[in-house]
């Protein structure tokens, strides 16, 4: 894979629901979570934990007590909650169709090629990391092609897949400007956000980057991006696509 | 948010409270003017549907979340992989109407990014307007708690979630007991400081009651899903 | 230093409209909600409404739903309350106060000077 | 809507001693271990000034003598000792939920 990634009104009666408490122990289904590993199924255990109190709190103006986890029509509980209060709600028309359909059939990257191979969000399909950003599209979403770029560790630096290397680097600060900060935030996701672009010395020992070949043209910042082995500024991109995680002094929190 | 104490203004800026039926249900963070990291327990069908929803950032108190005050979502997408039985992968996005504005109050949490390193017992954070002891009601102010990282492989032992924990969850809390988030918190952020920036290190999820000893707090490790989250970004875009 | 800046006088005549305007500095003006207050000649404080400048969306007393109208300008840093269909009851100081709603308490730290409307004919 | 009842509506306090001004809710004011209760004093041709926040709290650049005490339904103000500048009229405010309301005023005057 590549990227690693108005007033509250009193509360209600409520029932008591632990939640899924198997009666036998056994396998649950093999369940796939993102990134690089593969997850084994858990194991459950006739345990003493209540399993599962999701910590959600639902409740209604007029709440009504469900004793079963769907209810009849129109009113529908959490159930697997510790408070399990239900919201009465119309459903007829929250019919969500082919949208919820294509959003259920996505599969989630790495979910069924091997580790080396990164899946096709919009098909499925498995394409071998060598023609990941590669310039060339190989995804019917073309999606292997606008998820080269991420922010690596708590400095937030640039890095660039290389697709003959198969491996992410850091980006020079040779020659680089904000108008490409403002390109990589935006293939990231950050659609109207950027917030800073700056050289910091690269700590990370790396002896591989990615550098901009000025005299590219008005191409795409990728193709503009070449391997190289030296970074003469001694320094790499340092990326904020927003301006995120500040707080006013939480060191106030004590009162 | 049991054994916490009430928040100042701007402390947890990224803190936001979504409303069903002018009902707080879930706590969220801001991860954009324009998105919103809560839970995917907290969007379960008929709750996918954004109508439902508005959000309330930069308001501390329960009381003053009228329904001008709030952000309509005009989007729920809720983990692909999500498992309601197991709450495994159990995050959601909202996309708000209107883009929120950022002011002292209102910021949005840094997303973690890979290479990030936590050590075991990392101090982090957690907020939210959640009962303040199990089974209890509500909260009418913010409250946050300092609680501690555990070690999945110990969370994982036998006394604490048997083998429960998935690498998609991250245990937070205190083996003693007396600190934990709580129902009503659902959603709501686990965040730690590095570098002197904050970080969206999980998403409240699960617990077995609440500050019970040997049952820490459940949440979401926020760093397996940030490509996830950037995708759907992308996707919208 | 933090202001609220009103004018001082407003003469209108009965059934006609006003507009007060309210001029904020000092502050982040989207961080606070701004309250609009009534005060009758030798009388109390009545609570008109607030508008949160951030989404512009407004909560009024009952009492004053069909009479007022809050509006913000956020390049400006005003805030304006519109009275409409004026009559001699409207005849009051009308202060505009600021209210830090990203805090628990929910207090009116700073006033500003406040308008006098006089509705004569 | 909470109503907030002041009394008395008026008092006449000689220089020096203890004013007593009370407020009384329809409704509890307090929760989530808060007293939104607040005070304010109001002089002739002036806006209101905020004197004390949730209930016991001095606003910055208060003097000390003002003081506030009370919870859930029933609050008090305290001037004490009451200076020739403490003639005004005083307000009390509650914020437990919107709308936010006054009670009547209380008009201290001096003796």
């Known amino acids: 894979m590549a990227l690693n990634s108005g007033s509250p009104p009193a509360i209600g009666p409520y029932y008591e629901n632990h939640g899924y408490q198997p009666e036998n122990p056994y396998p649950a289904q093999p369940t796939v979570v993102p990134t690089v590993y593969e997850v084994h199924p858990a194991q459950y255990y006739p345990s003493p934990v209540p399993q599962y109190a999701p910590r959600v709190l639902t409740q209604a103006s007029n709440p009504v007590v469900c004793t079963q986890p769907k209810s009849p029509s129109g009113t529908v509980c959490t159930s697997k909650t510790k408070k399990a209060l239900c919201i009465t709600l119309t459903l007829g028309t929250f019919l969500v169709g082919a949208a919820l359909a294509a959003g259920l059939l996505w599969k989630f990257m790495g979910s069924k090629c091997s580790n080396s191979g990164i899946e096709c969000d919009s098909s499925g399909t498995c394409i071998n990391p060598s023609n990941w950003c590669d310039g060339v599209s190989h995804c019917p979403g073309g999606e292997d092609e606008n998820r080269c770029v991420r922010l690596y560790g708590p400095n937030f630096i640039l890095q660039v897949y290389s697709s003959q290397r198969k491996s992410w680097h850091p980006v020079c600060q040779d020659d680089w400007n904000e108008n490409y900060g403002r390109a990589a935030c935006r293939d990231m996701g950050y659609k109207n956000n950027f917030y800073s672009s700056q050289g910091i010395v690269d700590d990370s020992g790396s002896t591989s980057f990615m550098k901009l070949n000025t005299s590219a043209g008005n191409v795409d910042i990728y193709k503009k991006l070449y391997h190289s082995d030296a970074c003469s500024s001694k320094a790499v991109v340092s990326l904020r696509c927003i301006a995120c995680g500040v707080n006013l002094n939480s060191s106030r929190q004590s009162r | 948010i049991v054994g916490g104490e009430s928040a100042l203004p701007g402390a947890w800026p990224w803190q936001v409270s979504l409303h069903v039926q002018n009902v707080h249900v879930c706590g969220g963070s801001i991860i954009t003017p324009e998105w919103i990291v809560t839970a995917a327990h907290c969007v379960e069908k008929p709750l996918n549907n954004p109508a439902h929803w508005t959000a309330f950032a930069g308001i501390l108190r329960q009381s003053f979340m009228f329904y001008g005050a709030g952000y309509q979502v005009e989007k729920v997408i809720s983990h692909p992989n999500y498992d309601s039985k197991t709450k495994n992968n159990d995050i959601a996005l909202m996309k708000l109407q209107k883009p929120l504005t950022f002011n002292d109050l209102v910021k949005p949490v840094c997303l973690p990014n890979p290479g990030m390193m936590l050590q075991p017992e990392q101090l982090c954070w957690i907020s939210g307007w959640g009962a303040t002891e199990e089974k209890g009601k509500t909260s009418e102010v913010l409250n946050a708690a300092k609680v501690l990282l555990i070690e999945t492989q110990r969370c994982n032992s036998r006394y604490v979630y048997d083998n429960l924990i998935t690498p998609a969850m991250i245990c937070a809390g205190f083996l003693q007991g007396n600190v934990d988030s709580c129902q009503g918190d659902s959603g709501g952020p686990l965040v730690t400081s590095k570098n002197n920036i904050w970080w969206l290190i999980g998403d409240t999820s699960w617990g077995s009651g609440c500050a019970k000893a040997y049952r820490p707090g459940v949440y979401g490790n926020v760093m397996v899903f940030t490509d996830w989250i950037y995708r759907q970004m992308r996707a919208d875009g | 230093q933090v202001q609220l800046q009103q004018p001082g006088a407003e003469l209108a005549k009965p059934g006609a409209s006003v507009k007060l305007s309210c001029k904020a500095s000092?502050?982040?003006?989207?961080?606070?909600?701004m309250h609009w207050v009534k005060q009758r000649p030798g009388q109390g404080l009545e609570w008109i409404g607030l508008i949160p400048p951030n989404s512009g969306s407004s909560n009024y007393n009952e009492k004053f739903k069909s009479k007022a109208t809050l509006t913000v300008d956020k390049s400006s840093r005003t805030a304006y309350m519109q009275l409409s269909s004026l009559t001699s009851e409207d005849s009051a100081v009308y202060y505009c106060?600021?209210?830090?709603?990203?805090?628990?308490?929910?207090?009116?730290?700073?006033w500003g000077t406040g308008t006098t409307v006089t509705v004569s004919s | 809507d909470i109503v907030l009842t002041q009394s008395p509506a008026s008092l006449a306090v000689s220089l020096g001693q203890r004013a007593t001004i009370s407020c009384r809710a329809s409704e509890s004011v307090s929760t989530s271990g808060y007293s939104y209760m607040h005070w304010y004093q109001q002089k002739p041709g002036q806006p209101p000034k905020l004197l004390i926040y949730l209930a016991s709290n001095l606003e910055s650049g208060v003097p000390v003598r003002f003081s506030g005490s009370g919870s859930g339904t029933d609050f008090t103000l305290n001037i004490h000792p009451v200076e020739e500048e403490d003639a005004a009229t005083y307000y009390c405010q509650h914020s437990r939920e919107l709308p936010p309301t006054f009670g009547a005023g209380t008009k201290l005057e001096l003796k």
């Open positions: 000092g502050y982040t003006f989207t961080s606070y909600w």
């Open positions: 106060a600021r209210w830090d709603y990203g805090s628990s308490y929910g207090y009116f730290d700073v």
